[in-house]
C-alpha cells in the first residue's frame, strides 16, 4: 500500500478580516492511525492551531466530521479572522506514540493572507493658531490595514495639495499596517471657511476611499483692522466717535478705550456681524463731552484679539474747533493713527 | 447547549465499588477525550484519566491504574468512572470534563462509609 | 508527571487591587510554540471554570480584569481591579502530557 500522504490543495487563500478560512487538508490513507493537528508556522517555535482531541479551540471548526469511519478530510475553518491570524498553515499526520504522538507527515503548507480595512483617517492640525501667510502643518493617521500597498491624497477645498510626506510603517512584512502623512498648508485670509481633507484609497475599500477632515476655523486667526471715525456732532458739546473692528476670527475680542491713554470704557465683542468669508466685524462708539476737556484729547480705540498682543488706532479730538460736520481721517484729527501693538 | 449530566450522590462501604455516569448532550460525543478528575473535601484537583469514546483507548495516571476503570457507550453518549476497593480516602467529588477545558459535569460526590 | 507548584497558597487583597498568582511548572509546558497552560476558578459547590487557556488567551465570557502570562515553565494569573465577586480557589493546569494540577490558591478580601 502506498505510504499517506498529507495534501493541501490550496498554496495560499485570500480572507477579509472578519470573515471566515476555510483551510482544506485530506489525508490519502487511514494508516499509519494517529490524529492530525494543524500548526501556524514551522519547525519548533510553531503554533498549535487545532488539535483533534484535546484543547480549547473556540474559533476553530472541522469541516466533515472526523469521528466518521474512513473520514480522510481534516480542513477546518477558522472564524472571525483578523491581521494577526496571517501567516502560512500546515496539517500534519501523527503517528501513535508514547508518551507522545510523533509526526509522520505534514502537508506543503497553505498561506493565508488577510485583507483589513484602513481605520477612518484621523486628521489633526497644529496646536496653536495661526495667521494668514503661514504655513501650518496637518497629520493624517491611519491604522489596521493589510496589505501594506496603499494610497493618500490631500485636498484643501477640493485641490490637491503636493506638499506632503507620507510613511507606511513598519517597513518589513506585518500582519497589519498604519500609514503618518504630514502636509503643510498655506493660510490665507479668506480660510475661516475652508476644510482640509485627507484621503485613503485601498484595495479593501472597493473604489471608496476613507475621508478625514480638519476645518481650518480651528486653525487660523484673521488680526482686525481698525478704523477709528468722528462722526458728526449730535450736540454743541457731544462727539461721537466710532471704532470699526473687521474683518477677524475668530471672535474672542475685546475692546478698550482710552482718552488721553487713561482707561474709558472695556468691552467684549457680543452682536458682531459675519462677512461671507466666516471673518467677523464688529462697531464700538464712545460719546466724548468736549466741554470737560481744555486740551485736544487723544482717544484710542485698543483691541485685543484672541489672546493676542493689543493693537490700537489713535484719533485726535480738537477741542478748540467745533465744526458742525467734522470728515473722518483727515491730517489733522488722525494724527496717530497708525496701528501698533501695545506691550 | 453542551453539558455533562453526572449521576447523583453514592454513600457506600469499604471495599466495595461504585460506577459513576457522565452523559454528554449538545456535542458530538466521540470527537474529544473525556476526562475524569478528583477532588477530595477541601483540597486540590486530581487527574484520574482520560478515555477517547471513538475508540475506547485510556490513559490513566499510575496513581490510579489500579483504582479506576474508564468505560464509554456511544450509543447512549455516556461515560462512566468505576471505583474499586473503596477506602475513606475515595472520599471525594468526581468530575468528568471534556478536552476543551471548558465543559465540566456538576459533580458526583462519593462517600465511603461503614 | 509534570509538577505544578502553585503560590501563594492563600492571598487577600483590597477591592480594586491587583491579584498575582503564580504556577510553576517542574519541566516545560511548551508543544512547539504554544504554552499549554490553563486556568481555572472554582466556587464552592461548583465545578471548575476555566479563565484562561493556552497561557494567555481569555476564556469565553471571562471578564477582562483576567490575564494570563508567561512561557516554558513560569506561569502567572492576574486580576485587576480583584472585585467582590473574585473570592474564589483558583487552579493552573497543564495538559502538555496527560493532565495535571498545582495545589490551588484561595483568594479573599482585605
Known amino acids: 500500500e502506498e505510504e499517506l500522504q498529507v495534501i493541501q490543495p490550496d498554496k495560499s487563500v485570500l480572507v477579509a478580516a472578519g470573515e471566515t478560512a476555510t483551510l482544506r487538508c485530506t489525508a490519502t490513507s487511514l494508516i499509519p492511525v494517529g490524529p492530525i493537528q494543524w500548526f501556524r508556522g514551522a519547525g519548533p517555535g510553531r503554533e498549535l492551531i487545532y488539535n483533534q482531541k484535546e484543547g480549547h479551540f473556540p474559533r476553530v471548526t472541522t469541516v466533515s466530521d472526523l469521528t466518521k469511519r474512513n473520514n480522510m478530510d481534516f480542513s477546518i475553518r477558522i472564524g472571525n479572522i483578523t491581521p494577526a491570524d496571517a501567516g502560512t498553515y500546515y496539517c500534519v499526520k501523527f503517528r501513535k506514540g508514547s508518551p507522545d504522538d510523533v509526526e509522520f507527515k505534514s502537508g506543503a503548507g497553505t498561506e493565508l493572507s488577510v485583507r483589513a480595512k484602513p481605520s477612518a483617517p484621523v486628521v489633526s492640525g497644529p496646536a496653536a493658531r495661526a495667521t494668514p501667510q503661514h504655513t501650518v502643518s496637518f497629520t493624517c493617521e491611519s491604522h489596521g490595514f493589510s496589505p501594506r500597498d496603499i494610497t493618500l491624497k490631500w485636498f484643501k477645498n477640493g485641490n490637491e495639495l503636493s506638499d506632503f510626506q507620507t510613511n507606511v510603517d513598519p517597513v518589513g512584512e506585518s500582519v497589519s499596517y498604519s500609514i503618518h502623512s504630514t502636509a503643510k498648508v498655506v493660510l490665507t485670509r479668506e480660510d475661516v471657511h475652508s476644510q482640509v481633507i485627507c484621503e485613503v484609497a485601498h484595495v479593501t475599500l472597493q473604489g471608496d476611499p476613507l475621508r478625514g477632515t480638519a476645518n481650518l476655523s480651528e486653525t487660523i486667526r484673521v488680526p482686525p483692522t481698525l478704523e477709528v471715525t468722528q462722526q458728526p456732532v449730535r450736540a454743541e458739546n457731544q462727539v461721537n466717535v466710532t471704532c470699526q473692528v473687521r474683518k477677524f476670527y475668530p471672535q474672542r475680542l475685546q475692546l478698550t478705550w482710552l482718552e488721553n491713554g487713561n482707561v474709558s470704557r472695556t468691552e467684549t465683542a457680543s452682536t458682531v456681524t459675519e462677512n461671507k468669508d466666516g471673518t467677523y466685524n464688529w462697531m464700538s462708539w464712545l460719546l466724548v463731552n468736549v466741554s470737560a476737556h481744555r486740551d485736544d484729547v487723544k482717544l484710542t480705540c485698543q483691541v485685543e484679539h484672541d489672546g493676542q498682543p493689543a493693537v490700537s488706532k489713535s484719533h485726535d479730538l480738537k477741542v478748540s474747533a467745533h465744526p458742525k460736520e467734522q470728515g473722518s481721517n483727515t491730517a489733522a484729527e488722525n494724527t496717530g493713527s497708525n496701528e501698533r501693538n501695545i506691550y | 447547549e453542551v453539558q455533562l449530566q453526572q449521576s447523583g450522590a453514592e454513600l457506600v462501604k469499604p471495599g466495595a465499588s461504585v460506577k459513576v455516569s457522565c452523559t454528554g448532550s449538545?456535542?458530538?460525543?466521540?470527537?474529544?477525550?473525556l476526562h475524569w478528575v478528583k477532588q477530595r473535601p477541601e483540597q486540590g484537583l486530581e487527574w484520574i484519566g482520560r478515555i477517547d469514546p471513538e475508540n475506547d483507548s485510556t490513559k490513566y495516571d499510575p496513581k490510579f491504574q489500579d483504582k479506576a476503570t474508564l468505560t464509554a457507550d456511544t450509543a447512549s453518549n455516556t461515560a462512566y468512572l468505576q471505583i474499586s476497593s473503596l477506602t475513606s480516602e475515595d472520599t471525594a467529588v468526581y468530575y468528568c470534563?471534556?478536552?476543551?477545558?471548558?465543559?465540566w459535569g456538576q459533580g458526583t460526590l462519593v462517600t465511603v462509609s461503614a | 508527571d509534570i509538577v505544578l507548584t502553585q503560590s501563594p497558597a492563600s492571598l487577600a487583597v483590597s477591592l480594586g487591587q491587583r491579584a498575582t498568582i503564580s504556577c510553576r511548572a517542574s519541566?516545560?509546558?511548551?508543544?512547539?510554540?504554544?504554552?499549554?497552560m490553563q486556568w481555572y476558578q472554582q466556587k464552592p459547590g461548583q465545578p471548575p471554570k476555566l479563565l484562561i487557556y493556552?497561557?494567555?488567551n481569555v476564556g469565553s465570557g471571562v471578564p477582562a480584569r483576567f490575564s494570563g502570562s508567561g512561557s516554558g515553565t513560569d506561569f502567572s494569573l492576574n486580576i485587576h481591579p480583584v472585585e467582590e465577586d473574585d473570592i474564589a480557589m483558583y487552579f493552573c493546569q497543564q495538559t502538555r502530557r496527560v493532565w495535571t494540577f498545582g495545589g490551588g490558591t484561595k483568594l479573599e478580601i482585605k
Open positions: 449538545g456535542f458530538n460525543f466521540k470527537d474529544m477525550y
Open positions: 493556552a497561557a494567555s
Open positions: 470534563a471534556r478536552g476543551n477545558y471548558v465543559h
Open positions: 519541566e516545560s509546558v511548551q508543544y512547539y510554540g504554544t504554552s499549554l
